[in-house]
């Protein structure tokens, strides 16, 4: 059902797993401890999903419901300007750097962040239900 | 309430070697960059290094680069600034300071100092 | 490296005064740019970045403008404790460089 290539949308798909929060077609993790925006990549690749990325104003403003002051990383990289990790462009909202160490994105309720990527952070995770490809 | 204390400051031959200390406390060091920013008797504030939250990232002014070390114990609370090759134009007080969060490299909290005199 | 050169270097204003300080960056810094206030014999203490965002505690008679070169702190109303030395900081990237400071004297 939501079979496809890395970053398709997932099609209407069945429950997620423990902890994980279904909203729309996805399922979101919302960490609990902190890791470096590095470290938090790797524990959503490793539960076959990726570092959140936020296809539009609608969604980004649904998950900022659940978010607090505190911010979360998302899978949001400068590299020669603002990315997604799917390789698109962040195009529906700002974001701006203060320094030249602040090349990673978060998220609070307040909206989108700039950070050194070694700050330890909480972290969102995306993904299909259970091991479907389908990441974004 | 953020606290940065410096020490290891005193006289030193030219050509000599100091270590200094900054103790952090009232927040979470190994969530922060950390800088010395110096200040020659009567003259202005000059930025001397930087150092990433785990010190794998150092950067430095060409006026010190080769002759100063920025290092940090995180388990220790603890900013380091070890300077070698002394010169009289390094006489100055040095500041220990923290930036503003998340990278934001202003420097939001300041030690009160500590004098260093290289002279003979 | 970026250079930043402050106007006036010194300058004397009387209590409830509006003053005005300029630093000017050699290049286009945008707005990234902090300002701190130093007393003799104490360290800095940080009262603006990103050229106009008050720290927290910051007195509201303080304000900064500008963005690109130009860029001013502006104290609305003088008061005793205010009679310091000024200093602007380029904060994005390496080096971090000062102005050279302004001293605000008592009239």
């Known amino acids: 059902l939501c079979q496809g290539s890395n970053y398709s949308t997932c099609a209407s798909c069945p429950s997620c797993p423990d902890r994980w929060m279904k909203y729309g077609n996805h399922c979101y993790y919302f960490s609990v401890e902190e890791k470096d925006w590095n470290s938090s990549l790797e524990f959503c690749l490793a539960r076959d999903s990726h570092l959140l990325v936020i296809t539009d104003n609608q969604e980004m403003s649904l998950l900022q419901v659940f978010l607090s002051e505190a911010f979360c990383w998302i899978g949001l990289r400068n590299n020669s300007g603002w990315r997604w990790e799917d390789g698109s462009p962040l195009n529906f909202s700002r974001i701006s750097s203060n320094s030249f160490v602040q090349t990673c994105g978060a998220i609070n309720k307040n909206g989108l962040q700039a950070s050194s990527c070694e700050v330890p952070l909480h972290w969102v995770c995306k993904k299909c239900p259970f091991a479907d490809q389908a990441l974004f | 309430e953020v606290q940065l204390v410096e020490s290891g400051g005193g006289l030193v031959k030219p050509g000599g070697s100091l270590r200094l200390s900054c103790a952090a406390s009232g927040f979470t060091f190994s969530r922060y960059y950390m800088s010395w920013v110096r200040q020659a008797p009567g003259k202005g504030l000059e930025w001397v290094a930087t150092i990433s939250i785990s010190g794998g990232n150092v950067y430095y002014p060409d006026s010190v680069k080769g002759r100063f070390t920025i290092s940090r114990d995180n388990a220790k609370n603890t900013l380091y600034l070890q300077m070698s090759s002394l010169r009289a134009e390094d006489t100055a007080v040095y500041y220990c300071?923290?930036?503003?969060?998340?990278?934001?490299?202003?420097?939001?909290?300041w030690g009160q100092g500590t004098l260093v005199t290289v002279s003979s | 490296d970026i250079q930043m050169t402050q106007s006036p270097s010194s300058l004397s204003a009387s209590v409830g005064d509006r003053v005005t300080i300029t630093c000017r960056a050699s290049?286009?810094?945008?707005?990234?740019l902090a300002w701190y206030q130093q007393k003799p014999g104490k360290a800095p203490k940080f009262l603006i970045h990103?050229?106009?965002t008050l720290a927290e505690g910051v007195p509201s008679r303080f304000s900064g403008s500008g963005s690109g070169t130009d860029f001013t702190l502006t104290i609305s109303s003088l008061q005793p404790e205010d009679f310091a030395t000024y200093y602007c900081q380029y904060h994005y990237g390496i080096p971090f460089t000062f102005g050279q400071g302004t001293k605000l004297e008592i009239k």
């Open positions: 990103n050229a106009k």
């Open positions: 290049e286009n810094i945008y707005s990234a």
């Open positions: 300071a923290r930036e503003g969060g998340y990278g934001n490299l202003w420097f939001a909290y």
